[in-house]
């Protein structure tokens, strides 16, 4: 019965799989959801370890400064180019992030605790 | 869309290493891993290795790790295979290719390297 | 490390036939499976990426199936410059593995 339903799945013209996702921990057996029109197939996968001791995250951006408080939305925002992705990551080459704008007050306090994370 | 031009072919005694270069322009080079992979004459397709040009982490196929070194320069975006004492077996077309999960591929024209006495 | 096996060694086929190539893996490799045409004196073209996955530039006749340890190429409609070698390759794990190749050859 299982082989019978991939290999129907196999008929759709292409699959969009999700990331692995381990069962326990960050490393070993787990799934991987793959989804075509109205299917869904749930497969399962092996995160290796020494990828994610490698690289911990699957995607690393290297990050602009944080531009100006946009009054309207309350918001600012920076972009990320794509700096290292894991092998198999099918990563963005941009990302881009917004935050709240905080006082001035604020982003002193923020930027002395915050400093080299950002 | 990222081009890759590898170095001409080379012509060595054994025991004699070489050094293939790996030029590429267009994208951002430092971005993607960058494998080796070689091919005998005939033969098929052998995955050496690969390496990161944002920190040059290196993963080596254990069967080349005394034959081959992977360096990059990200100031000519450029990336190197060196082959340590070569032996006639080692005779081959060396290819390098810029891997990107999200949009695939991108392959040299490849290098012979022929090691003859 | 992963063996991949692909069968048939060489496929005799005319042109507007249907190819199905096979690979199959020694242990599951989820999707983390992608094909490879190579002609003579060229370097390898990427043609489906992880198992199913399309390739940009890459004609539509060519799709690919999957994931586990059982994985199928197939060119709907055989066109003359499609005669080449074709590979698998799996990413799924260290060291990187390519099986041995199909020569699909005309008949």
């Known amino acids: 019965k299982k082989k019978e339903k991939v290999k129907k799945g196999s008929e759709c013209s292409e699959w969009t799989w999700g990331p692995c996702t381990p069962s326990s921990k960050d490393c070993g057996m787990g799934f991987r959801e793959g989804t075509c029109g109205a299917q869904t197939q749930r497969v399962h996968c092996k995160v290796p370890c020494n990828w994610k001791k490698e690289f911990g995250a699957d995607c690393k951006y290297k990050f602009e400064s944080w531009g100006a408080c946009d009054g309207s939305t309350g918001t600012k925002a920076r972009q990320g180019t794509l700096k290292k992705a894991r092998y198999n990551a099918q990563c963005q080459e941009t990302i881009r992030v917004t935050k709240p704008c905080t006082s001035k007050t604020k982003s002193k306090t923020k930027a002395k605790k915050g400093k080299g994370k950002d | 869309q990222v081009q890759l031009v590898q170095s001409g072919a080379e012509v060595k005694k054994p025991g004699h290493s070489v050094k293939v270069s790996c030029k590429a322009s267009?994208?951002?080079?430092?971005?993607?891993?960058m494998n080796w992979v070689r091919q005998a004459p005939g033969q098929g397709l052998e995955w050496i290795g690969m390496?990161?040009?944002?920190?040059?982490?290196?993963i080596l196929n254990q069967k080349f790790k005394d034959k081959a070194t992977l360096t990059v320069d990200i100031s000519t975006s450029t990336a190197y295979m060196e082959l340590s004492s070569p032996r006639s077996e080692d005779t081959a077309v060396y290819y390098c290719?810029?891997?990107?999960?999200?949009?695939?591929?991108?392959w040299g024209q490849g290098t012979l390297v022929t090691v003859s006495s | 490390e992963i063996v991949l096996t692909q069968s048939p060694a060489t496929l005799s086929l005319s042109p507007g036939e249907r190819a199905n190539l096979s690979c199959r893996a020694s242990?599951?490799?989820?999707?983390?499976l992608h094909w490879y045409q190579q002609k003579p004196h060229q370097a390898p073209r990427l043609l489906i990426k992880y198992a199913s996955q399309s390739i940009s530039g890459i004609p539509a006749r060519f799709s690919g199936s999957g994931p586990g340890t059982d994985f199928n190429l197939t060119i709907s409609s055989v066109e003359p410059e499609d005669f080449a070698v074709y590979y698998c390759q799996q990413s799924n794990s260290w060291p990187l593995t390519f099986g041995g190749g199909t020569k699909l050859e005309i008949k």
């Open positions: 390496i990161h040009p944002s920190d040059s982490e290196t």
């Open positions: 267009g994208q951002s080079f430092s971005s993607y891993w």
């Open positions: 242990e599951s490799i989820s999707n983390n």
């Open positions: 290719s810029s891997w990107s999960a999200k949009r695939g591929d991108f």
